[in-house]
Amino acid sequence: FNISGCSTKKLLWTYSTRSEEEFVLFCDLPEPQKSHFCHRNRLSPKQVPEHLPFMGSNDLSDVQWYQQPSNGDPLEDIRKSYPHIIQDKCTLHFLTPGVNNSGSYICRPKMIKSPYDVACCVKMILEVKPQTNASCEYSASHKQDLLLGSTGSISCPSLSCQSDAQSPAVTWYKNGKLLSVERSNRIVVDEVYDYHQGTYVCDYTQSDTVSSWTVRAVVQVRTIVGDTKLKPDILDPVEDTLEVELGKPLTISCKARFGFERVFNPVIKWYIKDSDLEWEVSVPEAKSIKSTLKDEIIERNIILEKVTQRDLRRKFVCFVQNSIGNTTQSVQLKEKRG
């Protein structure tokens, strides 16, 4: 299709080489098409246009994204050619940064059902640049944590070194939805709840004598509880003796609950005590079996191919540790009688 009629928007993504970060493009169809199509809920009854441009569908995922190759080749369907780019409803997610993401991206509705739809498309010219060392040293992270129940704030990474007074007007989105009342480079959260978690996007306009473009940054916000003040506790094994059958295989499970820590380095391991000797056992990898906001339960098994007489003289010890301290639980094997 002819893209000369598409509205054009220029965007700049300056990424940090120090951290992983994502980027998004919204299918910013020109008003009133966008309102009716992708963000239909932004129309108030008084704003309904005389002829609704997209009569085809109101399904939010009904847009098609293309990339325009720089060599003038035909448009390429994003989904077929770019595995690191994911389409979610009207949004294109770039999972990895890199200058190779620079280029022109076009979106338009899949269903063309009226003559007005033909020119209904938007071309986004994306320029991707690594952050220079001259940039602000203490810029806000693209991953920000908010402590549940307390006050917090979300800073726009590309503007976090500027004072509120210097800062240009910022447009914020949360999970693709415009936050129309938030206009500064920092969103103040009066009290943090779990619903504050999500993907936030901040945009501002930068201009030179020739043109203007939108500088965009994406912030992943996570709501967290305060770091635990407790060492982990062992939920299983509970008993310190275990009845076993000689010659049979045996699996002993160690399950431990670790309280939330922002920097989480849990340790869970098995070792064997035999008279004065003790050694760590090579066992299968630990696995998380339940994870909540407050804690995580991790399990690690020790597997004996067959129980021997020697095993009855040993103690099998599960050792768990976090930054606060450690806990152990030992199990002595006992032969089943009868």
Epitope: H39, N41, R42, T151, I154, L178, S180, V181, D190, E191
Partner: antibody, heavy 118, light 111 residues
Amino acid sequence: SLEESGGGLVQPEGSLTLACTASGFSFNNNYYMCWVRQAPGKGLEWVACIYTGSTGSTYYANWAKGRFTISKLSSTTVTLQMTSLTAADTATYFCARDDKVEHGYGLWGPGTLVTVSS
Amino acid sequence: DVVMTQTPASVSAAVGGTVTINCQASESIDNWLAWYQQKPGQPPKLLIYSASNLASGVSSRFEGSTSGTQFTLTISDLECADAATYYCQSTFYGVNPVPNAFGGGTEVVVK
């Protein structure tokens, strides 16, 4: 409970400060304390809110920005300063508190009448 | 600011009947919507919060529902005491749960 005070007759272009006093609870529990007005025979109109927690964030209806100022005076009193008043500001002004669980105004004062007239 | 458009302005129904009041938000507010009942000379009373949850002490004859940016309050088994003006309100502002803009109100007359 909540009680508004400070209403009365004021000249056009005049100023007035309303107060809202809480009893039975204090603002230390971090509430949104708000002002809502209702012109005679008309509907409810949101004016402003203040968060009584550490951020002290203030929120205003677009039409109220610049003319009205909401403040926390103490742990039990919130005020609304109104300037450049016109006849259109004649209304009963209610003080209301959000309910932290049932989001919305769970507690209201009886209201105070402000009349702007020469 | 979000604009809340409430319809109809007035509705009349007989005792035992049902009335439906609609409220349209100018932008997405998810489920952040409250409904109030106001009788003459009194402050409003919270009926429903988070679009469909009944406030404490409120009769189950009041029901809130939502579809996108359209919200509905249904009052069934009408009683004389239900005669009042009903208002919807957005209860979210930016990223904070600040109760703010009201709808224009709907007067319910019980015959």
